[in-house]
């Protein structure tokens, strides 16, 4: 570490003394304190030497000298005073930039130390300071602000007590600059528009920032509009504020607008979308199939999407038949809006009666007209299956019935034992109806089929059984002949 | 040169509207904002409203919101004005002044005058 | 919305000297403010925007001058074509607002 002779940490003299400032060090040295006048720089070597014959309260300040070779990068210093009984500060800048939040030093650096206990900091023209300004002063440095807010950006003097009267500096200006964050923040609304030609339009583009120091500009495709601006300063932010006024807008005016704010970090950019119409309109669409098949039991929601302008005066569900004349409930008819010209109305039907099987349907009304979009729900059901013996053209027969939804396929089987089904065990023969006569058929019914087992001869320690079965499930009836008759029944539950 | 040409004097009853207009030459009319100012009886000058003669934009100080429509017809480069439900209130000189700055939001001093439009109010 | 203030209605002047006519903003407008001049009989002319910059046109004796909410026009070398009715105008934000104007008179 190099050294500075005269070895005291802190030299007062008068003014016009004559001032030798010698650092000594290892290997070369260089010196460096606050740019004053009269200062002889020379080096002999492993020394460097400052001097002045003429000492003024200018060269007061901290000189420190440093040896660049060495890596721990060592360094001494020495404090001289130059106590001028009309100079009592020696201002080493006239003005300081902060940001806010920084410690902002000013460097009055006073002249004599003796002066220390009468020193205080000032705004200029004697103003106090303001409320809430913690400072702290060092005879080496100056007066620190710390953590300077915005606000404190003023011209400040610092006052000493000479003789009973104040004495000041010349005046040093503060700046605190506000940190930025980022670019701009931006409100562009709508977030989307739609109008009809020669109606009335309003976007608003808007932006705040700490700083006013921020460009705002609303474009439209790619021309900046010229938009007079409405400035504002509230929870301490500068708000910049476009406002576009269309009296009777035109097809011109369609198309995409971005609100755009730039400061010194940045840009933002947002956008809209305005779409200019001839005639309101009223669309109505499903992602569902309007075709719906549910098992009976089960619930289903149904689901449309209506894309209005101007918004709608009525909507509603309504079920239109075949069975009873009830209504859907309207607390399972639900409606949720998307944005301002998109909304998706729901019909929740929970655990479907077979009643409920049918033409549903939505309607909704706007300016532009009516529109209805119909859902039709057909119930699925397992098949119920009865079988009976009789005479058909003086052949004996067996005769099946299947009801159920979808159409049944039937099965006939004919197996061994008396059983109220058989198993693979038991099985002595199966006949497969691929086209069982269609007896009935209506929409939203369950469809009925009847299949005919011509039996020329019945087998009494036998059963015969009708299956029948669907997407939904299946069903069966077995028949036993016995010597009194023949005797049926279905499966045990 | 640039010159806004506005009609002539007005004499109006009270509750009656006018429109005055303000005929653009020299210059691009679409390419500039067109402001309209009233100074009544030599007292100062306040800003009534605007209007953007290619998008048809138009924005208004409050004060004289629905007392006043701007209005524009590109293919005359002429700018209107409409005073409507007139009262004592409303006799002054209206002015039409073009936007100084070309593009952008950022300013919006007034570099080029009409002569004046002398609307008076009186039963 | 922003006041302007032009504290002198009037103001005494001698021709060939200077003067110096002050406008105050009721809120900070950031140099966005305008300076007219006005003859009897005729409209407003644009002598100043952005608080310093002289039209085309315009004298090089005006000049303006001024930041945040004070803002002047200066005039030197007056002459009597100048002994007439000036206005600020801000234009910071809607709705633009002028001063109440100021009328030099010859002393």
């Known amino acids: 570490i190099p050294v500075i002779e005269p070895s005291v940490p802190e030299l007062v003299v008068k003014p016009g003394a004559t001032v030798t400032l010698r650092c000594v060090g290892n290997g070369s040295v260089e010196g460096d304190g606050p740019p004053s006048p009269h200062w002889t720089l020379y080096s002999d070597g492993s020394s460097s030497i400052l001097s002045t014959n003429n000492a003024t309260f200018q060269n007061t300040g901290t000189y420190r000298c440093t040896e660049p070779g060495d890596p721990l990068g060592g360094s001494a210093a020495i404090h001289l005073y130059v106590k001028d009984p009309a100079r009592p500060w020696n201002v080493l800048a006239q003005e300081v930039v902060v940001f806010e939040d920084q410690d902002a030093l000013l460097p009055c650096l006073l002249t004599d130390p003796v002066l220390e206990a009468g020193v205080s900091l000032v705004r200029v023209r004697g103003r106090p300071l303001m409320r809430h300004t913690n400072y702290s002063f060092s005879p080496w440095h100056g007066f620190t602000i710390h953590r300077a807010k915005f606000i404190q950006s003023q011209d400040y003097q610092c006052s000493a007590l000479m003789g009973g009267r104040k004495v000041m500096s010349i005046s040093i200006r503060l700046k605190v600059q506000k940190v930025i964050p980022g670019p701009p923040a931006l409100t562009l609304v709508p977030a989307e528009l739609v109008r009809i030609r020669g109606e009335a339009a309003q976007i608003v583009c808007s932006a705040s920032s700490v700083d006013v120091n921020f460009d705002v500009f609303l474009q439209h495709n790619n021309t900046k509009l010229a938009i007079p601006q409405q400035s504002d300063f509230h929870n301490n932010r500068y708000q910049k504020v476009l406002t576009l006024n269309l009296d009777q807008v035109d097809f011109q005016h369609a198309g995409n607008y971005s609100c755009v704010a730039s400061n010194v970090q940045g840009k933002h950019s947002t956008s809209m979308f305005f779409r200019v119409v001839e005639s309101a309109y009223l669309n109505l669409s499903s992602e569902q199939n309007l075709i719906q098949e549910v098992t009976v039991g089960e619930g289903l929601n149904l689901k449309v999407m209506v894309e209005a302008y101007p918004g709608l005066q009525g909507f509603n569900w309504t079920y239109l038949g075949p069975f009873s004349d009830h209504q859907p409930e309207p607390k399972l008819a639900n409606a949720t809006t998307k944005d301002t010209y998109r909304h998706t109305f729901t019909l929740s039907l929970p655990r479907l009666k077979p009643s409920e099987a049918g033409r549903y349907s939505f309607l909704a009304r706007n300016p532009g007209g009516w529109r209805a979009l119909t859902f039709e729900l057909t119930l699925r059901y397992p098949p119920e299956v009865s079988v009976i013996w009789t005479f058909i053209n003086g052949s004996g027969t067996l005769l099946c019935a299947a009801s159920g939804y979808p159409q049944p396929n039937v099965t006939w089987l004919q197996c061994s034992g008396h059983t109220d089904r058989c198993d693979e065990a038991q099985v002595l023969q199966v006949w497969d109806d691929p086209y069982p006569e269609v007896l009935s058929q209506e929409p939203f019914h369950k469809v009925t089929v009847q299949s005919l087992l011509t039996v020329e001869t019945l087998e009494h320690n036998q059963t015969y059984e009708c299956r029948a079965h669907n997407s939904v499930g299946s069903g069966s009836w077995a028949f036993i002949p016995i010597s009194a008759g023949a005797h049926t029944h279905p499966p045990d539950e | 040169e640039v010159q806004l040409q506005q009609s002539g004097p007005e004499l109006e009853k009270p509750g009656a509207s006018v429109k005055i207009s303000c005929k653009a030459s020299g210059y691009s009319f679409t390419g500039y904002n067109m402001n309209w100012v009233k100074q009544s009886n030599g007292k100062s000058l306040e800003w009534i409203g605007n209007i953007d003669p290619y998008y048809g934009g138009t924005t208004y100080n409050q004060k004289f919101k629905g007392k006043a429509t701007l209005t524009v017809d590109k293919s005359s480069s002429t700018a209107y004005m409409q005073l409507k439900s007139l009262t004592s209130e409303d006799s002054a000189v209206y002015y039409c002044?073009?936007?100084?700055?070309?593009?952008?939001?950022?300013?919006?001093?007034?570099?080029?005058w009409g002569a004046g439009t002398t609307v008076t109010v009186s039963s | 919305d922003i006041q302007m203030t032009q504290s002198s209605s009037y103001l005494s002047v001698s021709l060939g000297g200077r003067v110096t006519i002050t406008c105050k903003a009721s809120?900070?407008?950031?140099?966005?403010l305008a300076w007219y001049q006005q003859k009897p009989g005729n409209a407003p002319r644009l002598l100043i925007s952005g608080a310093t910059s002289l039209e085309t046109g315009v004298p090089s004796r005006f000049s303006g001058s001024g930041s945040g909410k004070d803002y002047t026009l200066s005039i030197t070398s007056l002459q009597t074509e100048d002994v007439v009715t000036y206005y600020c105008q801000q234009y910071w934000s809607t709705p633009f607002t002028f001063g109440s104007g100021t009328k030099l008179e010859i002393k």
């Open positions: 809120d900070h407008i950031n140099n966005w």
């Open positions: 002044a073009r936007r100084g700055d070309y593009s952008g939001s950022s300013y919006w001093y007034f570099d080029v």
